[in-house]
């Protein structure tokens, strides 16, 4: 039975050109994490394998950095980065757990519009 739960950083609104950290945490299970995949829509961004370490997809190499921990850092954000990101935890013996984070990247003109938020 899958007893674990995934906690995420929560959805993030950020400004174009900035950087943000996406993080997930798997709790309430003793299952062993064998691999964590980070995906956006149907694109694989990065893999963190328990034995082999990190692999960043070639098309994201210059803007995606591994960590902290099992998280992912996205740099030089563009409006095109707006979308849903998935952390997919492959575990044994439980199976797969998935967390969802939506990233909204705003043009500077929109970001300044009437808000009192911390803009990453």
């Amino acid at each position: 039975m899958m007893t674990g739960t995934i906690e995420t950083t929560g959805n993030i609104s950020a400004e174009k050109g900035g950087s943000i950290i996406l993080q997930c945490h798997l709790s309430s299970t003793t299952a062993q994490v064998t691999q964590v995949n980070w995906e956006q829509q149907d694109q694989l961004l990065a893999i963190c394998n328990a034995d082999l370490g990190w692999h960043i997809s070639p098309s994201f190499k210059d803007r995606v950095a591994p960590g902290p921990g099992l998280g992912l850092t996205l740099q030089s954000l563009t409006v095109n980065d707006t979308g849903e990101y998935f952390c997919i935890y492959h575990t044994y013996p439980d199976g797969t757990y998935t967390g969802r984070i939506f990233l909204e990247v705003l043009e500077s003109s929109v970001a300044e519009h009437g808000a009192r938020f911390q803009i990453p």
Partner: antibody
Framework: EVQLQQSGPELVKPGASMKISCKAS????????MNWVKQSHGKNLEWIGL????????SYNQKFKGKATFTVDKSSSTAYMELLSLTSEDSAVYYC??????????WGQGTTLTVSS | DVVVTQTPLSLPVSFGDQVSISCRSS???????????LSWYLHKPGQSPQLLIY???NRFSGVPDRFSGSGSGTDFTLKISTIKPEDLGMYYC?????????FGGGTKLEIK
């Protein structure tokens, strides 16, 4: 002035599909997400999901995955939601709403869908 | 999914009253950057819902200052300082911090 103009009421038969349109004006269509919300029985509000008109990226409430499909036509600043395999449970008022910072700033006037044989 | 519980379900008022509506979430709505995506809406009969407050306490443009929002973490409040006839309707809170976004069940503000 920001405006979201939705298509008119629909009466459709069970098992059919239908598409609701939402034409945006008064702002840069690709700069904001477009969200869809269901209101059943004149009370309950449910977030169906959103689309990013800039790149067509979508995010669905899992409850509506396979039921709703979002698309956009950037040339006409119009967002669409197609509802599939309709049943009486899908009878409701559907709203499009412009999103910013995970709130719904401006709403369309709503489209009433009645599913009945 | 995050469960959002709104109280009361119904709120009978007289014009001029001050009222509070509560919204509680099943988990914290603060993201890792300290931003909390909790907003409030008024849905008047025959109209579309309208945004009143976003980010806990920021009044949306054109919203009168008799509306104010407060709270943190899992506990949030909408206050209306002096009820006017145009304030009657259904009030909803919405959390947008966690996927999927979820609404409270609504509070009906009606005349006593």
């Amino acid at each position: 002035e920001v405006q979201l103009q939705q298509s008119g009421p629909e009466l459709v038969k069970p098992g059919a599909s239908m598409k609701i349109s939402c034409k945006a004006s008064g702002y840069s269509f690709t700069g904001y997400t477009m969200n869809w919300v269901k209101q059943s029985h004149g009370k309950n509000l449910e977030w169906i999901g959103l689309i990013n008109p800039y790149n067509g990226g979508t995010s669905y409430n899992q409850k509506f995955k396979g039921k709703a499909t979002f698309t956009v036509d950037k040339s006409s600043s119009t967002a669409y939601m197609e509802l599939l395999s309709l049943t009486s449970e899908d009878s409701a008022v559907y709203y499009c709403a412009r999103g910013l910072r995970f709130s719904l700033e401006y709403w369309g006037q709503g489209t009433t869908l009645t599913v009945s044989s | 999914d995050v469960v959002v519980t709104q109280t009361p379900l119904s709120l009978p008022v007289s014009f001029g009253d001050q009222v509070s509506i509560s919204c509680r979430s099943s988990q914290s709505l603060a993201n890792s950057y300290g931003n909390t995506y909790l907003s409030w809406y008024l849905h008047k009969p025959g109209q579309s819902p309208q945004l009143l407050i976003y980010g806990i306490s920021n009044r949306f443009s054109g919203v009168p200052d008799r509306f104010s929002g407060s709270g943190s973490g899992t506990d949030f409040t909408l206050k209306i300082s002096t009820i006017k006839p145009e304030d009657l309707g259904m009030y909803y809170c919405l959390q947008g911090t966690h996927q999927p976004w979820t609404f409270g069940g609504g509070t009906k503000l009606e005349i006593k």
